[in-house]
């Protein structure tokens, strides 16, 4: 259940997250499963553990194997396994199937290709993108944050896309590449002004002090894949990341669901260890696309 496959190329950086995730304050110990030997935490080592992350800087083919992570959570020490395979670099242009990440689909209206696993790394923009080993050039291609946007997508744009970036660790730079297939769908869709399904406008959500609470912002934006659509939370009119309260976090990555053929997104706001002062805040669920922005406000009240 808590085992994960990870792969990389020799002489590149590879960072693996423990499949058994705990809270940030929990200690995580890493071991070579075969020898039960502890993996060091000192950064001077080529392979070292850093909390929930196991870092190969850079990776070698001999690093392949199963690694055990033990999360020192209360009551139980919980175990996860990372099955790591490091491959030799290919001399030709073909990227073998075993190095491919999940395929993504796009259409004329939406052509985002996310760079796989990039969230684990300390990288700075811009990303370099390649299609079938050729560097992408031209105004149709835009590298934006951790994804590539292709304007006016055509069926010929299908193929294997590789992102390349630099991971920085204590001033040293390491190259990372990741490849995924992109397919093009012919889709007759439309977009409309965002419709927020939850929460209701001016909703009062009952919470218990000291416990965790989740608020879900859910909105639909039209039919088919949407080119630009987003849902997010604000606290007192401020972005969550700027608000500076570590107990209150948005769930990373927006879930895309299709309800009755409609393209919908939701974003979960997680409030850990609810405090009295959280009841004083204004929680805004924002949904926006090319048509505009809609806002629904929620307030918290103490459960009796």
């Amino acid at each position: 259940k808590f085992s994960k496959q990870s792969w990389g190329l020799e002489n590149e950086a590879l960072i693996v997250r423990c499949p058994r995730q705990g809270k940030p304050s929990y200690t995580v110990d890493w071991y070579y499963s075969q020898t039960n030997k502890s993996i060091p935490t000192q950064e001077r080592n080529r392979v070292f553990a850093s909390g929930q992350l196991l870092k190969f800087l850079p990776a070698e083919v001999a690093d392949s194997g199963i690694y055990t992570c033990i999360v020192r959570s209360p009551t139980f020490n919980r175990t996860g396994y990372a099955n790591v395979t490091i491959y030799k670099k290919q001399s030709d242009c073909n990227v073998p199937d075993y190095l491919m990440y999940s395929t993504v689909s796009g259409s004329e209206k939406n052509s985002k290709i996310y760079c796989p696993t990039i969230d684990l790394y300390n990288w700075t923009a811009p990303l370099e993108w390649f299609k079938n080993c050729q560097a992408l050039q031209g105004s149709r291609y835009r590298a934006h944050k951790s994804f590539l946007v292709i304007d006016n997508v055509m069926t010929e744009d299908a193929g294997d896309y590789t992102c390349k970036f630099i991971h920085n660790e204590n001033g040293a730079n390491y190259s990372v590449t990741a490849t995924r297939s992109f397919t093009v769908k012919d889709e007759q869709g439309f977009s409309l002004f965002p419709v927020i399904g939850a929460p209701a406008q001016n909703e009062i959500k009952e919470v218990e002090i000291g416990k965790n609470a989740n608020l879900t912002c859910s909105a639909c934006f039209g039919k088919g894949t949407q080119f630009l659509a987003a849902v997010l939370w604000q606290l007192n009119g401020t972005k969550i990341t700027d608000f500076g309260e570590p107990r209150i976090q948005q769930e990373e990555g927006q879930n895309q669901s299709f309800s009755n053929g409609l393209a919908c997104l939701d974003m979960v706001l997680r409030i850990a260890d609810v405090k009295e002062e959280d009841l004083l805040l204004q929680y805004d669920c924002l949904a926006l696309n090319l048509h505009g922005l809609r806002r629904h406000t929620v307030r918290l009240s103490r459960k009796n």
Epitope: F2, K23, T27, P74, T75
Partner: antibody
Framework: EVQLVESGGGLVQPGGSLRLSCAAS????????MHWIRQAPGKNLEWVSA???????YYPGSVKGRFTISREDAKNSLYLQMNSLRAGDTAVYYC????????????????WGQGTTVTVSS | DIVMTQSPLSLPVTPGEPASISCRSS???????????LDWYLQKPGQSPQLLIY???NRASGVPDRFTGSGSGTDFTLKISRVEAEDVGVYYC????????FGGGTKVEIK
């Protein structure tokens, strides 16, 4: 209503086997750590075994190798297979809910069953 | 293994009067997340145990506010501000830092 109901207790001879079941309802069973806790007649509470949401199992030395805890999330059920039973295993066995192993939230052992009696005697 | 020691073994009480039970652990129950993994349970005669206090000082849902948990590190206390007749039974402390270990119990009975 959040509820745990144990069954399967009874009289068994030393060296025999017994399988206890616990039916859970009223909560998302699959995300919780679950425990078996026992109480010998007139004695204190003793932790017997636990299973987390991944299916990893935990036992004290006194029952390791003899007892096996398991769960069937699709049926909201917890089990305890007890082999090589001894007179010292005679007790009321409680099924109990632990922390939320998904979110790592702990609110105590907050739900207990009514208990099922196991008697090991010749 | 963490060993839990409770005192007193027996506690005769007068309704309306306060009562206090002590619990000591063989090692600190403070986890790296900042919480003390110490709970208090009450087992009334003929019943299953019920949770009173979790994480050292948090009252469980539905527990009257006359029950208060306090303490840190290895020393913890359960206080009943004004004992009522329904409070009789055996009180157990339990650590949940490393698996589960129960204290020996304190029998509270009306004088």
């Amino acid at each position: 209503e959040v509820q745990l109901v144990e069954s399967g207790g009874g009289l068994v001879q030393p060296g025999g086997s017994l399988r206890l079941s616990c039916a859970a309802s009223g909560f998302t069973f699959s995300t919780y750590d679950m425990h078996w806790i026992r109480q010998a007649p007139g004695k204190n509470l003793e932790w017997v075994s636990a299973i987390d949401l991944a299916g990893d199992t935990y036992y004290p030395g006194s029952v390791k190798g003899r007892f096996t805890i398991s769960r069937e999330d699709a049926k909201n059920s917890l089990y305890l297979q007890m082999n090589s039973l001894r007179a010292g295993d005679t007790a009321v066995y409680y099924c109990a809910r632990g922390g939320d192993g998904y979110n790592y939230d702990y609110y105590g052992i907050d739900v207990w069953g009514q208990g099922t009696t196991v008697t090991v005697s010749s | 293994d963490i060993v839990m020691t409770q005192s007193p073994l027996s506690l005769p009480v007068t309704p309306g009067e306060p009562a206090s039970i002590s619990c000591r652990s063989s090692q600190s129950l403070l986890h790296s997340d900042g919480y003390h993994y110490l709970d208090w349970y009450l087992q009334k005669p003929g019943q299953s145990p019920q949770l009173l206090i979790y994480l050292g000082s948090n009252r469980a849902s539905g527990v009257p506010d006359r029950f208060t948990g306090s303490g840190s590190g290895t020393d913890f206390t359960l206080k009943i501000s004004r004992v009522e007749a329904e409070d009789v039974g055996v009180y157990y402390c339990m650590q949940a830092l490393q698996i589960l270990t129960f204290g020996g119990g304190t029998k509270v009975e009306i004088k």
